[in-house]
C-alpha cells in the first residue's frame, strides 16, 4: 500500500492580489496520474470547481474572466488520481484590490529623512476601515498590518520607523480593508517615496527580527515600532 | 468635459417617493472616489444626506436624520448615481446636489443641482 | 459625531477689508478642512484643501490655516466679488454624522 498522494501546487497568475474586473488564472499542479481535479474555496460549498486535467494530465487551470468579490478567498485544491484523492495544496489567498477607495499616504514629519532619525507613515481613510496594510515595493515580505481590534474602526494608522537607515528608502503605498473580507482591499494609495539622506555610511542592518525595524531590509518583514497611537489598533506582520 | 449632472426634481406630494439620478462625465464613478448628496433648503445651510464609495463594494453612509428614509445607489454602467427619497415631507424641499470627493478630501467636483419641492 | 461650528454666521463688511471667518471642529478632523463659497442660485465652489491648499484658479487673496479643531478662513482684501457665503466642511464620512458642514458665514456689504 502507497502512502498518500503528494499534494498538489496552487498558484495564481498573473498573482494573487488582483485588481476589480481583472482577470486572474488559476493553477493546480499535481501529477501525470491525475484524472481530475479540484478546487475548493472557503466557506463555499465543495468543490467550488472541477476541472478535468491539461496534456499532459499533471495540472489544470481554473479561469477567472473578472475579478469580482465572490472570488476572493482561500483556496486550497485536491487532484485524484487511480488510487483515490490527493492531500490538499498548501491554501491560496487571493485579494482583491479596488472594494474601496483608495487612502492617503504620507509621512511625518517628512519623506525626506536623515538616517538614524525617525519617521512616521501615515495611512489615512475617509471613512472608518478596521485594516491598514503597507506595503513597499520590491521587497520580499511587503506586508505590514495594523488591524483593530474587537470590530472597533480606525480612520488611520502610523506605521513608525525608527531608527531609518539606507534600506527604508523606497516607494511605500498603503490600503485598507472593511470588516466584510480581508481579501477585499482599497484601491492602492498614490505612492510615497521615501528618501533617506545620509546613507552612504548606513551599514547594512541584521536580517534578525528586531522590532527596532519598522519598515525593514527586503530581506526581512517589515516590523511595527512605538506604541499603537490608537489603542483599538493591533499590529500583525508577516 | 468632467462634469456631474443631477435630474429628476420637481414637485411631489408629502408622503411621495422621487428617485434622483447624478450623472458623471469625463471621470468613471467606479474610479477612486466617493461621490456624496447635499441638500440645501430654501435660504438655509448646506447639509449633508449621505455618501457612496465607488469601489466595488459600495459603501454607503448617511446622516443620521435620513432614518431610512433615503437610499444611495449607483449604475457602473450607466455611470450614475441614485438617490431614491421615500415618505417626503414639506421640510424636504431644497436643492439637491451631488458632488465628488477628489483625493484631497474636499468635493472639488458639484453638480448644478435639482430643485424638489414636497407639497400638496 | 464631529459638530462643525462656523462663526461668525453674518459679517458686514467693505471692499478692502481684511476678513477672517473661524470654523471649529468638536474633535480633531487633523487637516481634512475645505472651505467653499456659494453664490445665490448657484453651487457651492471649493475654495481651499487640507486647511490651507489653495484650489486651482482661485486668488491668492484667500487663504486658509489650521489643524485639529481651530480653523481660519481669511480674505485679506476683500474684493466686490467676494460678497458671498463661505461654508467650511470635514473630509470624514461615518455613519455618525449629522452634517459635514458648517452652518455658514454670510458676508454682507456693509
Known amino acids: 500500500q502507497a502512502g498518500p498522494l503528494p499534494k498538489p501546487t496552487l498558484w495564481a497568475e498573473p498573482g494573487s492580489v488582483i485588481s476589480w474586473g481583472n482577470s486572474v488564472t488559476i493553477w493546480c499542479q499535481g501529477t501525470l496520474e491525475a484524472r481530475e481535479y479540484r478546487l475548493d474555496k472557503e466557506e463555499s460549498p465543495a468543490p467550488w470547481d472541477r476541472q478535468n486535467p491539461l496534456e499532459p494530465k499533471n495540472k489544470a487551470r481554473f479561469s477567472i474572466p473578472s475579478m469580482t468579490e465572490d472570488y476572493a478567498g482561500r483556496y486550497r485544491c485536491y487532484y485524484r488520481s487511480p488510487v483515490g484523492w490527493s492531500q490538499p495544496s498548501d491554501p491560496l489567498e487571493l485579494v482583491m484590490t479596488g472594494a474601496y477607495s483608495k487612502p492617503t499616504l504620507s509621512a511625518l514629519p517628512s519623506p525626506l529623512v536623515t538616517s538614524g532619525k525617525s519617521v512616521t507613515l501615515l495611512c489615512q481613510s475617509r471613512s472608518p476601515m478596521d485594516t491598514f496594510l503597507l506595503i513597499k515595493e520590491r521587497a520580499a515580505h511587503p506586508l505590514l498590518h495594523l488591524r483593530s481590534e474587537h470590530g472597533a474602526q480606525q480612520h488611520q494608522a502610523e506605521f513608525p520607523m525608527s531608527p531609518v537607515t539606507s534600506v527604508h528608502g523606497g516607494t511605500y503605498r498603503c490600503f485598507s480593508s472593511h470588516g466584510f473580507s480581508h481579501y477585499l482591499l482599497s484601491h492602492p494609495s498614490d505612492p510615497l517615496e521615501l528618501i533617506v539622506s545620509g546613507s552612504l555610511e548606513d551599514p547594512r542592518p541584521s536580517p534578525t527580527r528586531s522590532v527596532s525595524t519598522a519598515a525593514g531590509p527586503e530581506d526581512q518583514p517589515l516590523m511595527p515600532t512605538g506604541s499603537v497611537p490608537h489603542s483599538g489598533l493591533r499590529r500583525h506582520w508577516e | 468635459e468632467v462634469q456631474l449632472v443631477e435630474s429628476g426634481g420637481g414637485l411631489v406630494q408629502p408622503g411621495g417617493s422621487l428617485r434622483l439620478s447624478c450623472a458623471a462625465s469625463?471621470?468613471?464613478?467606479?474610479?477612486?472616489?466617493?461621490i456624496s448628496w447635499v441638500r440645501q433648503a430654501p435660504g438655509k445651510g448646506l447639509e449633508w444626506i449621505g455618501s457612496i464609495d465607488s469601489g466595488s463594494v459600495g459603501i454607503t453612509y448617511y446622516a443620521t436624520w435620513v432614518k431610512g428614509r433615503f437610499t444611495i445607489s449607483r449604475d457602473n454602467s450607466k455611470n450614475t448615481l441614485y438617490l431614491q427619497m421615500n415618505s417626503l415631507r414639506a421640510e424636504d424641499t431644497a436643492v439637491y446636489y451631488c458632488a465628488r470627493h477628489g483625493d484631497n478630501w474636499a468635493l472639488d467636483l458639484w453638480g448644478q443641482g435639482t430643485l424638489v419641492t414636497v407639497s400638496s | 459625531d464631529i459638530q462643525m461650528t462656523q462663526s461668525p454666521s453674518t459679517l458686514s463688511a467693505s471692499v478692502g477689508d481684511r476678513v477672517t471667518i473661524t470654523c471649529r471642529a468638536s474633535q480633531s478632523i487633523n487637516q481634512w478642512l475645505a472651505w467653499y463659497q456659494q453664490k445665490p442660485g448657484k453651487a457651492p465652489k471649493l475654495l481651499i484643501y487640507k486647511a490651507s491648499t489653495l484650489a486651482s484658479g482661485v486668488p491668492s487673496r484667500f487663504s486658509g490655516s489650521g489643524s485639529g479643531t481651530e480653523f481660519t478662513l481669511t480674505i485679506s482684501s476683500l474684493q466686490p466679488d467676494d460678497f458671498a457665503t463661505y461654508y467650511c466642511?470635514?473630509?470624514?464620512?461615518?455613519?455618525?454624522?449629522?452634517?459635514?458642514f458648517g452652518g455658514g458665514t454670510k458676508v454682507e456689504i456693509k
Open positions: 466642511q470635514h473630509g470624514y464620512i461615518r455613519g455618525d454624522l449629522d452634517n459635514v
Open positions: 469625463g471621470f468613471s464613478l467606479s474610479s477612486s472616489y466617493w
